[in-house]
Amino acid sequence: VLEVYYTHLRCRCVQESSVFIPRRFIDRIQISPRGNGCPRKEIIVWKKNKSVVCVDPQAEWIQRIMEMLRKKSSSTPPVPVF
């Protein structure tokens, strides 16, 4: 559900939202690192209805979700890719 996303597009986000999105509505969270065609880090949430929301990286709720996902991924053995 957490994905580091590289794009040739410049910044994808013009406005960022801090509004909480319940986990049940989230399909994937994409993180575009700073410098990847854009001077700032961007967090893009894909909702299950295919709408895309740019989230303020400082929003408490997204930081909590990302921390939880990081912990989960570090405790899960890597899956081989064929």
Partner: antibody
């Protein structure tokens, strides 16, 4: 590089079902965020979006055509298809398959297009 | 549905001219600060080709003589200095709301 190629019969009889296939290369239909779709253009007229399908099989249809249209995909063959039932002369058009850019989900755009295939509806 | 109206429907111009095509949407196509308006070029017998996305972003490989501007309901495509290969039909498209809709096209012809 990204390529899309339409195929199907060039002539369909009125009241029958038009079936087209688009074979893609350079990307996978199952990649997260991937969407592909169909657009048509009647002779001498403008473009009309018909339908598109997402990586997870979610389908979106133009309400004006929804009752007659089915879009589907076969990821293993790198193909997606369009079926349009009960065709009339008004469905005569060039049919294009296209790939959605993949940045904004339901608010995206068509970044890559096939060259188009002409379908004539006539008895 | 959002209706897209392009003007003019056809336009005669000469090589080197500056040309502006407008597209008006029946309601705003903006969301979260982004205008979901895109422009395509189509030459006879060919598929449309993406020129501009998000109202003003130039697609990779498109000459810098093309530019787009506008927000909410009113948008323009400008060609700063017409080249022989620019004579074609141009379409706008909105994707802010389903169904995605296109303008009727503007045919750019040689004067």
């Amino acid at each position: 590089q990204v390529q899309l190629q339409e195929s199907g019969p060039g002539l369909v009889k009125p009241s029958e079902t038009l079936s087209l296939t688009c074979t893609v290369s350079g990307f996978s239909l199952s990649t997260f965020g991937m969407g592909v779709g169909w657009i048509r253009q009647p002779p001498g007229k403008g473009l009309e979006w018909i339908a598109h399908i997402w990586w997870d099989d979610d389908r979106r249809y133009n309400p004006a055509l929804k009752s007659r249209v089915t879009i589907s995909k076969d990821t293993s063959k790198n193909q997606f298809s369009l079926k349009l039932s009960s065709v009339t002369a008004a469905d005569t058009a060039v049919y294009y398959c296209a790939r959605i850019a993949g940045y904004y989900g339901s608010r995206d755009w068509f970044a890559y297009w096939g060259q188009g295939t002409t379908v004539t509806v006539s008895s | 549905d959002i209706q897209m109206t392009q003007s003019p429907s056809s336009l005669s111009a000469s090589v080197g001219d500056r040309v502006t095509i407008t597209c008006r949407a029946s309601e705003s196509v903006d969301n979260s600060g982004i205008s979901f308006m895109h422009w395509y070029q189509q030459k006879p017998g060919k598929a449309p080709k993406l020129l501009i996305f998000r109202a003003s972003d130039l697609e990779s490989g498109v000459p810098s003589g093309f530019s787009g501007s506008g927000s909410r309901t009113d948008f323009t495509l400008t060609i700063s200095s017409l080249q022989p290969e620019d004579f074609a039909t141009y379409y706008c498209q909105q994707s802010n709301k389903d169904p995605w809709t296109f303008g009727q096209g503007t045919k750019l012809e040689i004067k």
